[in-house]
């Protein structure tokens, strides 16, 4: 049994880091493998993560952490029974993938303005809480070409757009994702999408 692709890990910078790797053949990850992780601190102890299958030869493990700070470093040991298959280290702050925003809501009752709001996925005491920026994706269910991205570079989790920038009388969907420049993170996953029917009063044409 050998590791074909070494574990790569990303952290949500709150409580979970996710590591993925591939073995050289079909593997029952949960019964054959264990990933041990330990904070590099004299008095810390190793924790055991039981991996799950992620495709035939792929494994994924969700490492639980009390919290994360920028200088934390973890040792990682991948074991198959008594055999050490791989040894490495992981600094969560250098591999951050933020949590996805939630509770995306479209408010359509604000005088021909669409107000989209969502929730910051972090509690106020987490460093990322004040460092997230967002991308909002809006698309038409009827027209695949009607697809747009709005970059929200301010901290407030909301976006206002004129309803008239979208076509009237058809249904749209929106979703939002987040990233943090301070840690050069990857983008989060998209939030669940929300749907609304776009309608607004056409302005009277004057001749």
């Amino acid at each position: 049994m050998k590791v074909l692709q070494e574990p790569t890990c990303v952290s949500d910078y709150m409580s979970i880091s996710t590591c993925e790797w591939k073995m050289n053949g079909p593997t029952n990850c949960s019964t054959e493998l264990r990933l041990l992780y330990q904070l590099v601190f004299l008095l810390s102890e190793a924790h055991t993560c039981i991996p799950e299958n992620n495709g035939g030869a792929g494994c994924v493990c969700h490492l639980l952490m009390d919290d994360v700070v920028s200088a934390d470093n973890y040792t990682l040991d991948l074991w198959a029974g008594q055999q050490l298959l791989w040894k490495g280290s992981f600094k969560p702050s250098e591999h951050v993938k933020p949590r996805a925003p939630g509770n995306l809501t479209v408010h359509t009752n604000v005088s021909d303005t669409l107000l989209l709001t969502w929730s910051n996925p972090y509690p106020p005491d987490n460093y990322l809480y004040n460092h997230l920026t967002y991308a909002v994706n809006i698309w038409s269910e009827n027209d695949p070409a009607d697809f747009r991205i709005y970059n929200v570079t301010y901290l407030e989790p909301s976006l206002r757009i004129a309803a008239s920038t979208l076509k009237s009388g058809i249904s749209y969907r929106a979703r939002v994702r987040a990233w943090a420049q301070c840690y050069n993170t990857t983008w989060s996953e998209w939030s669940p999408s929300t749907k609304w029917h776009n309608s607004y009063r056409e302005p009277f044409e004057q001749h």
Partner: antibody
Framework: EVQLLESGGGLVQPGGSLRLSCAAS????????MSWVRQAPGKGLEWVSS????????YYADSVKGRFTISRDNSKNTLYLQMNSLRAEDTAVYYC?????????WGQGTLVTVSS | QSVLTQPPSASGTPGQRVTISCTGS????????VNWYQQLPGTAPKLLIY???QRPSGVPDRFSGSKSGTSASLAISGLRSEDEADYYC???????????FGGGTKLTVL
């Protein structure tokens, strides 16, 4: 809110014994290493002993090795320090501290006086 | 005598910047993370800096830590009267297999 409350201090004669306790609340005690640090009157801080979350790793300062025993009861959220063969130089305020990356939370301390 | 050497005292006027040094060796500061603790008069110590330069939440950014080789420093800018306290550096010493504190520095705000 993390809280650490030491108890068990008092006056004891040289050669005597004392058992200190530290009751922890506000965090998952079994996930954290714990330590004892002392401070003699008018002096600086001196590390005494540390214990890992499960109790599998234990460390002592040379000045107390063989006389003091650190232990913990994770079911009771309590840290202990059994002190035997006490000497005058053990007189100090004894603090318990949660130990995660550093001694990040401290109790208010309990005074141990060794005197005849 | 401590294996970590700190000046016994330091002082400054309100608004000033003061620096407290901590000198060790390769068996302690040179290869381990340095922590700084503040002890206000009559109270328990409080963690001020960990991992050489990290501040716990709630510690003002007026406090900063740094490390170079076998020495560490604590800087306090915009000095305030409430900063008057004893400050201790600390780290693990591999050769002693012990957690060691500096002797402490008494900071006076004039």
């Amino acid at each position: 809110e993390v809280q650490l409350l030491e108890s068990g201090g008092g006056l004891v004669q040289p050669g005597g014994s004392l058992r200190l306790s530290c009751a922890a609340s506000g965090f998952t005690f079994s996930n954290y290493a714990m330590s004892w640090v002392r401070q003699a009157p008018g002096k600086g801080l001196e590390w005494v002993s540390s214990i890992s979350p499960s109790g599998s790793s234990i460390y002592y300062a040379d000045s107390v090795k063989g006389r003091f025993t650190i232990s913990r009861d994770n079911s009771k959220n309590t840290l202990y320090l059994q002190m035997n063969s006490l000497r005058a130089e053990d007189t100090a305020v004894y603090y318990c501290a949660r130990s995660y990356r550093a001694f990040d939370y401290w109790g208010q301390g309990t005074l141990v006086t060794v005197s005849s | 005598q401590s294996v970590l050497t700190q000046p016994p005292s330091a002082s400054g006027t309100p608004g000033q910047r003061v620096t407290i040094s901590c000198t060790g060796s390769s068996s302690n500061i040179g290869n381990n993370d340095v922590n700084w603790y503040q002890q206000l008069p009559g109270t328990a110590p409080k963690l001020l800096i960990y991992y050489d330069s990290q501040r716990p939440s709630g510690v003002p950014d007026r406090f900063s830590g740094s490390k170079s080789g076998t020495s560490a420093s604590l800087a306090i800018s915009g000095l305030r009267s409430e900063d008057e306290a004893d400050y201790y550096c600390a780290t693990w010493d591999a050769s002693l297999s012990a957690y060691v504190f500096g002797g402490g520095t008494k900071l006076t705000v004039l």
